[in-house]
């Protein structure tokens, strides 16, 4: 969370950004809020990126002005125009690329004053893991798969019954490059598992942490997955 203050004569406004992460190939949002101003035509939003000449996006007088937009962002940006008057200057970024990572500045000018704040935008790939019972191995095994990760994550297994146990010797993890030659599919197999025990497959890189849980009993297979972006907030 970054809060910036701006001074315009005697006037300053608070601009707030949130460090966020973009999933390459998907759409992302760079979050920025400011003190609302009911005079839409008096609001100017400028998004800038460190090291890039020209603007990422500009919104003024109630509409986009892309005359100074850098070509790498052409056709890929939008603000939430209907939410600008309530103080939302967040930027929608289509088809996130690895090269979109960096430091961005959200600059705001309104009739109340002006202000800006920076945000760090990380890019990579992250996806929810799915754990299934694996029948290819000779022993009772579990297979944890996640289709898209970058940079290469670490993978670890844990179990509710054997807390603190090291499963590296009874698991096998592989990374398979996807067709676009950037992201990778993660596959990890855990051997010699038992029923009535909850096993967790944890996948983590510097952008995200994902966990898949599975519990096999006589009567059912219970699964749960969750994904958490790191250093966001």
């Amino acid at each position: 969370l970054i809060i910036g203050f701006g001074i315009s004569g005697k006037h300053f406004i608070t601009v707030t950004t949130f460090t966020s992460a973009g999933n390459i190939g998907e759409d992302g949002t760079l979050s920025c809020t400011f003190e609302p101003d009911i005079k839409l035509n008096g609001i100017v939003i400028q998004w800038l990126k460190e090291g890039i000449k020209g603007l990422v996006h500009e919104f003024k007088e109630g509409k986009d002005d892309l005359s100074q937009q850098h070509e790498m962002f052409r056709g890929r940006t939008a603000v939430f125009a209907d939410q600008v008057v309530v103080g939302n200057a967040s930027l929608r970024l289509k088809n996130v690329q690895l090269t979109d990572a960096g430091t961005y500045t959200c600059y705001i000018r309104t009739s109340k004053g002006k202000g800006n704040a920076n945000l760090e935008y990380k890019t990579g790939a992250f996806s929810m893991p799915e754990i299934n019972v694996d029948y290819n191995a000779s022993s009772e095994s579990l297979r944890c798969e996640a289709p898209r990760w970058f940079p290469q994550p670490t993978v670890a297994w844990a179990s509710q019954v054997d807390q603190g146990a090291n499963f590296s010797e009874v698991s096998n993890t592989s990374f398979e490059l996807n067709s676009e030659n950037v992201t990778m599919k993660v596959v990890s197999v855990l051997y010699n598992v038992t029923i009535n025990n909850t096993y967790s497959c944890m996948i983590e890189n510097d952008i995200a942490k994902a966990t898949g849980d599975i519990k096999v009993t006589d009567s059912e297979v219970k699964r749960r997955s969750q994904l958490q972006l790191l250093n966001s907030g």
Epitope: V133, Y135, E140, I195, V216, T217, D218, S219, E220, V221
Partner: nanobody
Amino acid sequence: EVQLVESGGGLVQPGGSLRLSCAASGFTFTDFWMHWVRQVPGKGREWVSRISPDGSSTSYEDSVKGRFTISRDNAKNTVYLQMHGLRAEDTAVYYCTRFSTGWHRIEYFQHWGQGTLVTVSS
């Protein structure tokens, strides 16, 4: 209450055939893998075969591969074991059981019927 009722056993000559049936009730049949297990009198139980809930995946113990075929009719809540080329060593009480997965460690199975006796003898 889970109920499994096996039938179809009997006395058959070596090389002969039998078709075992198992009628299931008291649970959602299509949620479960079904397994056949056999027990030679005086010995421990041995897993024979399994079939996935939709019937698309089957597996067999090595000694029965190519001779036994497992199938299921989900409309009738029934699983079958077609046995050809029967041998003396196939003599056993045959049980069907259910489990949430295709894992087939005997100690995992909690529900058993009365079994059906298959005797292979000339």
